[in-house]
Amino acid sequence: NWVNVISDLKKIEDLIQSMHIDATLYTESDVHPSCKVTAMKCFLLELQVISLESGDASIHDTVENLIILANNSLSSNGNVTESGCKECEELEEKNIKEFLQSFVHIVQMFINTS
């Protein structure tokens, strides 16, 4: 359920507020609907960087849960093959705040277009 993913993103944003994490993360800020699964997989990979950088057990657990929820939601969409989409490394690097903002945006796209 994508709304549960949103809920975990809110938890992560609440948890990182008191931390100073300098990491920049590959961020897709203008997702084409035909590349949304590819983009989501990039977001999930980059999310693990936040987990590692924070060194925080609560963030680690929430990230782990979010990844499971998101992968379950992706698999329920069937095996979608997307072509002509950007590789994660081709995406713009952004700070954590902008990364999370764009992450919420793409999850919302999955909700809105379901």
Epitope: W2, V3, N4, I6, S7, K10, E13, D14, Q17, S29, D30, V31, H32, P33, L100, Q101, S102, V104, H105, Q108, M109, I111, N112, T113
Partner: antibody
Framework: QVQLQESGPGLVKPSGTLSLTCAVS?????????WSWVRQPPGKGLEWIGE???????NYNPSLKSRVTISVDKSKNQFSLKLSSVTAADTAVYYC????????????WGQGTLVTVSS | SSELTQDPAASVALGQTVRITCQGD??????ASWYQQKPGQAPILVIY???NRPSGIPDRFSGSSSGNTASLTITGAQAEDEADYYC???????????FGGGTKLTVL
């Protein structure tokens, strides 16, 4: 600075169709944002009508869904609202608004246009 | 329920602090945004996300959330803060945007 401007008839007859257009300037309707219509009956609160993404995806308020159509015209950088089978209860100020990226918000609003439903 | 509930009215003495609240189960999943609306004018976004202010919004406005409640706090209220305030979020399905009923703030 993004600006939004609503236009359309200020008076619609009962059982007719309300049609409004929102012209977007200072930004592209083909940005990552969703675009919404919101209304406010005189002396009452705000009610979300529906939203559109430039690829044509739409979502509508369930209470209005059977009567609402929102469309986008990328060549004119505008989006439109049609509300059918109107009654006096649809009399309101109608606003177009741009949704922010990420968490729910409307970061830019039109100035609003009053539409009265009356014979 | 997908509704967002606000108290219809609130008041604050000039220069004092007031907190306006918004309740709804969906706020466990989503942050709320807050709008100020003065008579005859379009709403203006004052707070969005965790506690973000658009440029031009004074820092006396702040937002917070806990459980199913979001709050807008005005610290050192000014006469020009007298207005209607609305909260906004998505419903529990995530598909639909919803508004609270609004709170009319009077500055005494």
């Amino acid at each position: 600075q993004v600006q939004l401007q609503e236009s359309g008839p200020g008076l619609v007859k009962p059982s007719g169709t309300l049609s409004l257009t929102c012209a977007v300037s200072g930004g592209s309707i083909s940005s990552s944002n969703w675009w919404s219509w919101v209304r406010q009956p005189p002396g009452k609160g705000l009610e979300w009508i529906g939203e559109i993404y430039h690829y044509g995806y739409t979502n509508y308020n369930p209470s209005l869904k059977s009567r609402v159509t929102i469309s986008v015209d990328k060549s004119k950088n505008q989006f439109s609202l049609k509300l059918s089978s109107v009654t006096a209860a649809d009399t309101a100020v109608y606003y177009c608004a741009r949704e922010g990226i990420g968490w729910p918000s409307f970061d830019y609003w039109g100035q609003g246009t009053l539409v009265t439903v009356s014979s | 329920s997908s509704e967002l509930t606000q108290d219809p009215a609130a008041s604050v003495a000039l220069g004092q602090t007031v907190r306006i609240t918004c309740q709804g189960d969906t706020l466990r999943n989503y942050y709320a945004s807050w709008y100020q609306q003065k008579p005859g004018q379009a709403p203006i976004l004052v707070i969005y996300g965790k506690n973000n202010r658009p440029s031009g919004i004074p820092d006396r406005f702040s937002g917070s959330s806990s459980g199913n409640t979001a709050s807008l706090t005005i610290t050192g209220a000014q006469a020009e803060d007298e207005a209607d305030y609305y909260c906004n979020s998505r419903d529990e399905s995530g598909k639909n945007l919803v508004f609270g009923g609004g709170t009319k703030l009077t500055v005494l």
